[in-house]
Structures are given as structure tokens and as C-alpha cells.
Interface confidence: low
């Protein structure tokens, strides 16, 4: 399927609107510090060039690869060296190294100001004045803050963003209509970004075999009626889509994702009975719907797995003939029978099964050796079951904020070298697992909880890789993708850690504390809690609770005072002294 002009091919396949949107996302994800206007100019130039190639595929430069065209365009940015430093060195390289170089300089934690939401009337005026620019600005701002955001999905978010403004800017109460929709988009967007980041980390750090294994397990749970060959085909196609998006090939990725959606909708009968309502929707919505589709019902008469994978005398023969296919079939068969298991647990079981066959197929009596392999799965299954049970009980007992605090203390004691903002962000997100998963029925709790935790812990791994400070974190993050969560769960108090010297400045608060939103107040208090644990890692729960209760009381008292600043100045040092005494 070769084309004289790749850029013309993608422009024609995607259409001008999606083409421009995807190029803007690609550029914004690579050059995260560039001003909006600069990116719009580059996108317009690329689009005009693409149109000349559509008109005449033999025109000059139309035969160049997309990486060459986009890279050349990015390297025309005048301030590259001043703004990005050594990233400018990428421009001295040839493709494909230049693109690899740009990819390596993507920043998961760019130094960008948090997005401030203007007044509703201001936003509606901007939307009506220039809708196209308003929506481009949205793509740009999200893409530069989330350099691995799944680009075709970001187009779907932008479409929903547009729909929200179109509807709510005409409503009687604009704010009541718009703000909940924007909050929902923000929260869903952050979750989508984090999920995609795990997919890219899986591909980039552990290879496509790891991603394919994840996809086999997940798709087998979703489509338990589909044949193994059908699941394998979907896995191959899905791997291609995500490899492209994670590699910055956003036009190819969006095009291939559309092809995959088309294929799934044309072959619903052999995939799942749940696809019908997705397939009636327009493209962006259809692809999103297919990705989020609920699990189909399990076939009623699935035989026991033991016959083919334990009792059969041909296990070692089948394994030796085609290891990956045999293990893939095992994973498929196990996953379609267990929608109640997390994907990560299923992958651990497949890994344990593989290890047993590696050992036993070389033994004198292989069958005798692997006869009890399913018994070995029991502790692997019980570990996440118990973890979910204990943490949901704790969540129900404490509520979200205090549950987050318990996790903050737990994780700061495990890895106190990690920066305080990272510990706060990650622990707050770990704590959200309670509200997200604990209300679900038993059969859905573990897949919800453990697979969500994998996404959150990947964020810790990604941030830590940028600035490595803890060997324990590096070990848990790099040794095994499927065992990351158990690895972190197993970490104990770091005995080698030298407690941080007490710094009164860290615990000095001002009247501006009183004007913060509830969420911002929580973050301030949780930041103080992490610093306390770093100062006194062996402090008991009771000691820390006492200090935090005093802190809350001190803040509440000063925020009610007439002269708030004076109160903070006077009461602050007393609180610090009392806290030090309590923790001595």
C-alpha cells in the first residue's frame, strides 16, 4: 500500500479538519514551550503544502516522509536553542534519529503554568468571536501539557468541548450548564492521558510483546465470544495504532484507528454483541465507544482449562512448537473466563505458567512436574483480592481525604527520597481508587482497582525516570511491568533514609491559605504531611494524626480571625513548636 506522496495520502484519508488538528497536536507535543501563534503558523504552512501534494503528488518534496516534512518544519523555529537547549541538537540529525531525538525530549512534567479557567462570559465571547481559534487553543494547551495524549481521542475531546460551548453559551444559566461539563472533560482527559501514558511506557520500555500480552488479556475479557484468531488480529492492529501514536506518527495512527473501527463494525458478529450501538455513531465517537465498550457475556459452556493446559500430554510439545502462540492462547482462554480479574493479575498468571513450563518441560517427568501448576496460581490471585478488600474497608472507614493521607504516609515512608509534589500528586490519585472502585460489585472491584493503580504508578515511574532519586523506585519501575504494583506494595519503611532536617519555612503559612479552594487547601495540608513524614519517618499514625488535627484547627482559627495574617504570624510558630514536641 505505497503512495507517491504520504502527506497527500493522509490528507485525503483524514480530511482537512482532522489533518490540521492532528498536526497541531503533534507539533504541540514535541515543542511544548512554543507559543500558540507559532504552532498555528507552522500548521498552516504544512496544510498548504499538503494541498499542493494532493493536487500533484509528483510536486517537489511531496515524496518525503512525514517525519522528514514535520521535522524540517519544527527545525525552522528560530528560538529552538534558547527555548529548548539541547533539543536543538536533534535538528543536526537525519531521520529516523531526528524523530527519536524529539521523542526522547518529550517532557512529562513541563514547566507550564496551570490552566486558569476564565469567567464563563469571557469564554463564551471568545468561542463566538472565533470558534476555530478557540478550539485550536484547546488542542494546543492540552497537547503541550500531555505530550503522549492519544491524539485521535484528543480530537474527540475537542468535539465534546465544542458541543459544550455551543449548547451552554445559549443557555439561560451558562455557568450551571457549562462548568459541570468542563469539569467532566478535565477529569476524563486527565484519566485518558494517564492511561495512554501507560500504553506508551509499556511499548517503549518493555517492547511490543508486553503490550500485545496486555491487549490479548484485555480484549479477551471484553470479547469472550470471539475466536483466538479474531482476538489476535485485533491485538496486532491495536498494537500498530498505539505504536504509531506513541512514536509521534499521529496521522498514521488516526488513520489506522479509523480502519480498525471500520473493521470491528463490519465484523461485529465474530467479535461482540455489544458493538452495535457504537457502530451507528460518527467516527470519533465510534472509536471512543469501541475502546470503552463493556465486556460481552461469557459463552455459557466454556470447558475447564485444565484439559488443554495441565492434563494433556502434549503441553510441552505444543509449548515448544510455538511458545508465544501457546502462551497467547492460554492467556486468551484464562482472560475470557475471568472478567473478575485485573489484566495485570492475568499477565502474572501467564508469566507463572510460562515459568513452570520452562522448568518442567526440561524435567525428567514434565507432566508430574506441572500437574499442580494451577494450585500455584492461588497466592497470586489472593494477594490483589486481599489488597482490594483491605483498602476498600479503609476507604469506607476514613473517606477520600483521610484515605489519601493514609496513602501519603505509607508511600512517603516507602520512598522518602521522591519529591514532595510527586508524592502528593501520586498519593492523591492512588486515593481516588476508593471512590472509583470500592462502590462497584465484588466482580468488578479488582479489575477496576488494580488496573487503575497500574496507571497511577506509571505516572510515578515516568516522573521518577526524569529525575531518579530512589533505587527502590527504579527497581520497581524497571524490573517487571506486571509486578510494579506488588513491588510497590511490598516496600517497607526505608531504614537507610536519613531524615530530612526540620525547616520551619516549610511549615510557615499565610492568610492566602484562607482564600484557597477546598482542593488547594487539601494539597497544602498534604504537602505539610509529607514533609512531616520526611522529617520523622518513624512517627506513629497517632502522632501524625494529632499534628494534622492541630494543623486543621490552627488554619480554621486563623481564617476566622479579623486579622488573619497576624494570627498566622503569631499562631504559626506555636503550631510548629507543638508539632516538634509531639513528634520528638
Amino acid at each position: 500500500d505505497t503512495h507517491k506522496s504520504e502527506v497527500a495520502h493522509r490528507f485525503k484519508d483524514l480530511g482537512e479538519e482532522h489533518f490540521k488538528g492532528l498536526v497541531l497536536v503533534a507539533f504541540s507535543q514535541y515543542l511544548q514551550q512554543c507559543p500558540f501563534e507559532e504552532h498555528v503558523k507552522l500548521v498552516n504552512e504544512v496544510t498548504e503544502f499538503a494541498k499542493t501534494c494532493v493536487a500533484d503528488e509528483s510536486a517537489e518534496n511531496c515524496d518525503k516522509s512525514l517525519h522528514t516534512l514535520f521535522g524540517d518544519k519544527l527545525c525552522t523555529v528560530a528560538t529552538l536553542r534558547e527555548t529548548y537547549g539541547e533539543m536543538a541538537d536533534c535538528c543536526a540529525k537525519q531521520e529516523p534519529e531526528r524523530n527519536e531525538c524529539f521523542l526522547q525530549h518529550k517532557d512529562d512534567n513541563p514547566n507550564l503554568p496551570p490552566l486558569v479557567r476564565p469567567e464563563v462570559d469571557v469564554m463564551c465571547t471568545a468561542f463566538h468571536d472565533n470558534e476555530a481559534t478557540f478550539l485550536k487553543k484547546y488542542l494546543y494547551e492540552v497537547a503541550r501539557r500531555h505530550p503522549y495524549f492519544y491524539a485521535p481521542e484528543l480530537l474527540f475531546f475537542a468535539a465534546r468541548y465544542k458541543a459544550a460551548f455551543a449548547e451552554c453559551c445559549q443557555a439561560a444559566d451558562k455557568a450551571a450548564c457549562l462548568l459541570p461539563k468542563l469539569d467532566e472533560l478535565r477529569d476524563e482527559g486527565k484519566a485518558s492521558s494517564a492511561k495512554q501514558r501507560l500504553k506508551c511506557a509499556s511499548l517503549q520500555k518493555f517492547g511490543d510483546r508486553a503490550f500485545k500480552a496486555w491487549a490479548v488479556a484485555r480484549l479477551s475479557q471484553k470479547f469472550p465470544k470471539a475466536e483466538f484468531a479474531e482476538v489476535s488480529k485485533l491485538v496486532t492492529d491495536l498494537t500498530k495504532v498505539h505504536t504509531e501514536c506513541c512514536h509521534g506518527d499521529l496521522l498514521e495512527c488516526a488513520d489506522d484507528r479509523a480502519d480498525l473501527a471500520k473493521y470491528m463494525c463490519e465484523n461485529q458478529d465474530s467479535i461482540s454483541s455489544k458493538l452495535k450501538e457504537c457502530c451507528d455513531k460518527p467516527l470519533l465517537e465510534k472509536s471512543h465507544c469501541l475502546a470503552e465498550v463493556e465486556n460481552d457475556e461469557m459463552p455459557a459452556d466454556l470447558p475447564s482449562l485444565a484439559a488443554d493446559y495441565v492434563e494433556s500430554k502434549d503441553v510441552c510439545k505444543n509449548y515448544a512448537e510455538a511458545k508465544d502462540v501457546f502462551l497467547g492462547m492460554f492467556l486468551y482462554e484464562y482472560a475470557r473466563r475471568h472478567p473478575d480479574y485485573s489484566v495485570m493479575l492475568l499477565l502474572r498468571l501467564a508469566k507463572a505458567y510460562e515459568a513452570t513450563l520452562e522448568k518442567c518441560c526440561a524435567a525428567a517427568d514434565p507432566h508430574e512436574c506441572y500437574a499442580k501448576v494451577f494450585d500455584e496460581f492461588q497466592p497470586l490471585v489472593e494477594e490483589p483480592q486481599n489488597l482490594v478488600k483491605q483498602n476498600c474497608e479503609l476507604f469506607e472507614q476514613l473517606g477520600e481525604y483521610k484515605f489519601q493521607n493514609a496513602l501519603l504516609v505509607r508511600y512517603t515512608k516507602k520512598v522518602p527520597q521522591v519529591s514532595t509534589p510527586t508524592l502528593v500528586e501520586v498519593s492523591r490519585n492512588l486515593g481516588k481508587v476508593g471512590a472509583k472502585c470500592c462502590k462497584l460489585p465484588e466482580a468488578k472491584r479488582m479489575p477496576c482497582a488494580e488496573d487503575y493503580l497500574s496507571v497511577v504508578l506509571n505516572r510515578l515511574c515516568v516522573l521518577h525516570e526524569k529525575t531518579p532519586v530512589s533505587e527502590k523506585v527504579t527497581k520497581c519501575c524497571t524490573e517487571s511491568l506486571v509486578n510494579r504494583r506488588p513491588c510497590f506494595s511490598a516496600l517497607e519503611l526505608d531504614e537507610a533514609y536519613v531524615p530530612k532536617a526540620f525547616n520551619a519555612e516549610t511549615f510557615t503559612f499565610h492568610a492566602d491559605m484562607c482564600t484557597l479552594s477546598e482542593k488547594e487547601k487539601q494539597v497544602k495540608k498534604q504537602t505539610a504531611l509529607v514533609e512531616l513524614v520526611k522529617h520523622k519517618p518513624k512517627a506513629t499514625k497517632e502522632q501524625l494524626k494529632g499534628v494534622m488535627d492541630n494543623f486543621a484547627a490552627f488554619v480554621e482559627k486563623c481564617c476566622k480571625a479579623d486579622d488573619k495574617e497576624a494570627c498566622f504570624a503569631e499562631e504559626g510558630p506555636k503550631f510548629v513548636a507543638a508539632s516538634q514536641a509531639a513528634l520528638a
Partner: nanobody, 115 residues
């Protein structure tokens, strides 16, 4: 403990060939994409070639395309780089790395191309 040990470097005349090996241990080699990276004296590390976990997908820097071949033997946990038609500008310390990283976590093997 992750360990990568390169071997096979040496002094060779322009136009000559060498085969580098990288023996891996301490991790599931067959699950990872691997790369070769080189560093010439006084220069930064330069990515040379990459191969996916199964060995099907290989990528090369323009400067070595058509001359170098990357391969792997997952059973032996070994990565290879066959270098033909070597040029003086290929002179560098060669390192194998996990994934597409250009950060060096090993000792490397010296390749010198000179007449």
C-alpha cells in the same frame, strides 16, 4: 541485577568487518526492544540501531544503513551488530542498551577503524 556485557570490538582497516555481541542477564531479555548506541571521543552518544523484542522490526541510523545489521538470539539472551564496510567515522565506543535509550549502563566495546 541488570547486566549488559559487550564484546567483539577491535582495530580494523577501512572496508573491513566486525561482529559485536552483547550478553544480557538479570532481566527478561526476550521482552525488551534493544539498541546499539555509540560514542566517539569528545562527542555525545549517538543511537545506531534498534530491534524489537521478537526481532522482526529493525531500525538504523542513516549513517549506517546498508552496512550494519542488528539481530538477536533470545534463547541465548544475546544481541548482535554485524558491521560491514567499516569507515573511519565509525570509530567509537559501542554500547548496547535496553529499549531506545541512549543512556549507557554498560562498559562498552571499542571499535577503531584505521589504516
Amino acid at each position: 541485577e541488570v547486566q549488559l556485557v559487550e564484546s567483539g570490538g577491535g582495530l580494523v582497516q577501512p572496508g573491513g568487518s566486525l561482529r559485536l555481541s552483547c550478553a544480557a542477564s538479570g532481566f527478561t531479555f526476550g521482552s525488551f526492544g534493544m539498541s546499539w548506541v555509540r560514542q566517539a571521543p569528545g562527542k555525545g552518544p549517538e543511537w545506531v540501531s534498534a530491534i524489537d523484542s521478537g526481532g522482526a522490526d529493525t531500525r538504523y541510523a542513516e549513517s549506517v544503513k546498508g552496512r550494519f545489521t542488528i539481530s538477536r538470539d533470545n534463547a541465548k539472551k544475546t544481541l548482535y551488530l554485524q558491521m560491514n564496510n567499516l569507515k573511519p567515522e565509525d570509530t567509537a565506543m559501542y554500547y548496547c542498551t535496553i529499549g531506545r535509550s541512549t543512556s549507557r549502563g554498560s562498559q562498552g566495546t571499542q571499535v577503531t577503524v584505521s589504516s
